[in-house]
């Protein structure tokens, strides 16, 4: 059992074409956090926010991920193949790495409202 | 297999600055769930943590050696150093560096280097 | 700063014996203890990490146990290349301490 917990926006929708924000949090933890990785579903990574560095936004997605806010990542011109999973992986020290899950669902539907709701994976 | 080697002087004058340094081979410095840290041990006595690096620079020291102590990375040679200014013949020690891991819960020291002896005298 | 406290700091066992090394922190330090094994000379090894887990590579006569503020580290059987000093550490906070060692030595 970690120290901290990581609280993300869960299960979320939006809908195709449009944008969605991925966030997690942090919290009940003194540890210093020294980086901040995004993984695709495929365990690509999207980008990387370093406490020394700033962001680096992978070539592959710099069309369409723009960083923030805060360590969160907003994906932008959604796609149905964006649909899956999604992780925000903290390092911290002395702590050693927390994991969060996201998972996003891309609905052709215009009805399809973009839920963001923060809960503990 | 990961290797750890300390390099520097083996003696150092009073209020001078102690530099070392610690290659790394057999895995990279740049690996993104590791840290690296420097540990004493003055002679007959106990284990001290001076601090620890992340690859891109973000430090944490110890606070008992207050603004004495820097580390750098040499990601490009995959090294880190210890820089430790103004020492005293209470830095004399033996000086380790070591690997923060493996991927667990407030991970341990997995990987040490052999340590290397130095001595603060004129 | 969490101060870590061992005990004993010293003791003599025979080969075979069953050694159980202890230490205490000042405060909870949850489950975030690991131990090591240094012989003269040479680095400290890791032996067990998160109070109980064996680091790959380490015979299975080591053990430890332990949670909170009190922790053991527990020799089955005493071997003749298990003579050497013992640490504990915590790594649940920095700045990281280490306990000040249990040298175990022949009887």
């Known amino acids: 059992m970690m120290t901290g917990t990581i609280e993300t926006t869960g299960n979320i929708s939006a809908k195709k074409g449009g944008s969605v924000i991925l966030q997690c949090h942090l919290s009940s933890t003194m540890a210093q956090v020294t980086q901040v990785n995004w993984e695709q579903h495929d365990h690509s990574l999207l980008a990387i926010r370093n406490a020394e560095l700033g962001w680096h936004i992978y070539p592959a997605f710099k069309d369409r991920v723009a960083p923030g806010p805060g360590l969160g990542l907003t994906l932008q011109s959604l796609t149905m193949n964006d649909t899956g999973e999604y992780f925000c992986t903290y390092h911290t020290y002395p702590d050693g790495t927390y994991r969060g899950r996201i998972f996003l669902e891309v609905l052709e539907s215009s009805v399809a409202e973009h839920s963001a709701r923060f809960q503990i994976p | 297999q990961l290797q750890l080697q300390e390099s520097g002087p083996g003696l150092v004058k009073p209020a001078e600055t102690l530099s070392l340094t610690c290659t790394v081979s057999?895995?990279?410095?740049?690996?993104?769930?590791?840290?690296w840290t420097w540990i004493r041990q003055p002679p007959g006595k106990c284990l001290e943590w001076i601090g620890t690096?992340?690859?891109?620079?973000?430090?944490f020291h110890n606070p008992s050696l207050k603004s004495r102590v820097t580390i750098p990375v040499d990601t490009s040679k995959n090294q880190f150093s210890l820089k430790l200014s103004s020492v005293t013949a209470a830095d004399t020690a033996v000086y380790y560096c070591?690997?923060?891991?493996?991927?667990?819960?407030?991970?341990?020291?997995?990987?040490w280097g052999q340590g290397t002896l130095v001595t603060v005298s004129s | 700063d969490i101060q870590m406290t061992q005990s004993p700091s010293s003791l003599s066992a025979s080969v075979g014996d069953r050694v159980t090394i202890t230490c205490r922190a000042s405060q909870s330090i949850s489950s975030y203890l690991n131990w090591y094994q240094q012989k003269p000379g040479k680095a400290p090894k890791l032996l067990i990490y998160?109070?109980?887990s064996l680091q790959s590579g380490v015979p299975s006569r080591f053990s430890g146990s332990g949670s909170g503020t009190d922790f053991t580290l527990t020799i089955s059987s005493l071997q003749p290349e298990d003579f050497a000093t013992y640490y504990c550490q915590q790594s649940y906070s920095t700045p990281i301490t280490f306990g000040c060692g249990t040298k175990v030595e022949i009887k």
């Open positions: 070591a690997r923060v891991g493996p991927d667990v819960s407030h991970p341990p020291f997995d990987y």
């Open positions: 998160a109070a109980s």
């Open positions: 057999g895995g990279s410095i740049s690996s993104y769930d590791h840290y």
């Open positions: 690096v992340y690859y891109s620079g973000s430090t």
